[in-house]
């Protein structure tokens, strides 16, 4: 926890941010908790970024105040309102840009007294993985697809069968720029497979790390799929 | 030592352009955000322009606005202050200034000596 | 644009005396305050931020305090080198702004 120390008489209250991650050209949540107040009136939220003059966000006596609101994030945010009274000073962040990645402190006042905390934001891109069989190929093959990445992450097979395995030598993973040229369509082949067996497939860059199963057996195939963002810590 | 040295000024008509430097050094200069302040013959301190510490966002006062444009070179630790259509009252000593804390609530920590611009027939 | 007026405009006081300096905001700027000294041909040098933090090296007579729209600065006790001119500074907008100054003479 990061706790203010009070100034001009008044206590200092404790702040809480979480670490967190954005997906470029979706809406992104900066974490923000702290001892609420009363009286809504009272609370005062700013939010700002490190490297940026104006404010992020301001919120103040049961509303938005964005007269000092910097350009670059005009339009993009809100608090969740109905919640600042219940100590959420969360801030929603829309259509998150690469420029967006950086450190944020979210400076709260209260009839109680002022704290702040600051996070670490990163932006990137990242999705889920599909893996098909490719019954075009001329040996059994695995793909591994997934439609949104940045910046370039890794991709490494296993198998529950061959734990330990290296597949670098029996697979390979290109990278195609999708249209805004800046994300990458992530694509994976995994030759040479057998069956009666479980495949992972795992994408993982600085941000996030996600993984797609795939169990081939003779009469059935089953597939699987999770994503976990990474470096989420509270300050 | 964290210094800032400030060029460029002098005697110019009205009319006229002029480009103040400001030389930085014993600091990460990226990371700052940079001020120009002026202060005219016997009067008080006016803010004219700033800059992030990307160079990304500027910003001016409205008395300069469309006439001062302010730049900053990292590769060369220098800022900029570029002035077109100079007048008479523009006359003032230019002070660069560095802007404390990482958010850009705090104050200006480290001021240049100043550089004289003098705008006269 | 945020008008930054402080009070007195000028003042006469003794070695040894306690100063204070007002400064009003036109609207609440919480504790984006800063304080400069400036010394005849020399540049301001910063002596609070934030409305009552000290940086580095700056005497411990010096304090300030408020936060809102009313901020003072004190003197504890006036040295022969505190005669100068002092400036308030707003920085909660991106539209900077100084007091007009408060001159500290000599009685």
């Known amino acids: 926890l990061i706790i203010g120390f009070g100034i001009s008489g008044r206590h200092s209250i404790t702040v809480t941010t979480v670490a967190s991650a954005g997906n470029i050209g979706e809406d992104g949540i900066l974490s923000c908790t702290f001892e609420p107040d009363i009286k809504l009136s009272d609370i005062v939220i700013q939010w700002l970024k490190e490297g940026v003059l104006g404010l992020v966000h301001e919120f103040k006596e049961g509303k938005d105040e964005l007269s000092e609101q910097d350009e670059m994030f005009r339009g993009r945010t809100a608090v969740f309102a109905d919640q600042v009274i219940v100590g959420n000073a969360s801030l929603r962040l829309k259509n998150v840009q690469l420029t967006d990645a950086g450190t944020y402190k979210c400076y709260i006042i209260t009839s109680k007294g002022k704290g702040n905390a600051n996070l670490e934001y990163k932006t990137g891109a990242f999705s889920m993985p599909e893996v098909n069989v490719d019954y075009n190929a001329s040996s059994e093959t695995l793909r591994c697809e997934a439609p949104r990445w940045f910046p370039q992450p890794t991709v490494v097979w296993a198998s529950q069968v061959d734990q330990g395995a290296n597949f670098s030598e029996v697979s390979n993973t290109s990278f195609e720029l999708n249209s805004e040229n800046v994300t990458m369509k992530v694509v994976s082949v995994l030759y040479n497979v057998t069956i009666n067996n479980t495949y992972s497939c795992m994408i993982e860059n600085d941000i996030a790390k996600a993984t797609g199963d795939i169990k081939v057996t003779e009469s059935e195939i089953k597939r699987r799929s999770h994503l976990q963002l990474l470096n989420s810590k509270a300050s | 030592e964290v210094q800032l040295l400030e060029s460029g000024g002098g005697l110019v008509q009205p009319g006229g352009s002029l480009r103040l430097s400001c030389a930085a050094s014993?600091?990460?200069?990226?990371?700052?955000?940079m001020h120009w302040v002026r202060q005219a013959p016997g009067k008080g301190l006016e803010w004219v322009s700033a800059?992030?510490?990307?160079?990304?966002?500027?910003y001016y006062a409205d008395s300069v606005k469309g006439r001062f444009t302010i730049s900053r070179d990292i590769s060369k630790n220098t800022l900029y202050l570029q002035m077109n259509s100079l007048r008479a009252e523009d006359t003032a000593v230019y002070y660069c200034?560095?802007?404390?804390?990482?958010?850009?609530?705090?104050?200006?920590?480290?001021w240049g000596q100043g550089t004289t611009v003098t705008v006269s027939s | 644009d945020i008008q930054m007026t402080q009070s007195p405009s000028s003042l006469s006081a003794s070695v040894g005396d306690r100063v204070t300096i007002t400064c009003r905001a036109s609207?609440?700027?919480?504790?984006?305050l800063a304080w400069y000294q400036q010394k005849p041909g020399k540049a301001p040098k910063l002596l609070i931020y934030?409305?009552?933090n000290l940086p580095t090296g700056v005497p411990s007579r010096f304090s300030g305090s408020g936060s809102g729209t009313d901020f003072t600065l004190t003197i504890s006790s006036l040295q022969p080198e505190d005669f100068a001119t002092y400036y308030c500074?707003?920085?909660?907008?991106?539209?900077?702004?100084f007091g007009g100054g408060t001159k500290v003479e000599i009685k």
């Open positions: 800059i992030s510490g990307s160079g990304g966002s500027t």
């Open positions: 609207q609440n700027i919480y504790t984006w």
């Open positions: 200034a560095r802007l404390l804390g990482r958010f850009g609530e705090y104050g200006m920590d480290v």
């Open positions: 934030d409305a009552t």
């Open positions: 500074q707003q920085s909660y907008s991106t539209r900077w702004t």
């Open positions: 014993g600091f990460t200069f990226n990371t700052h955000a």
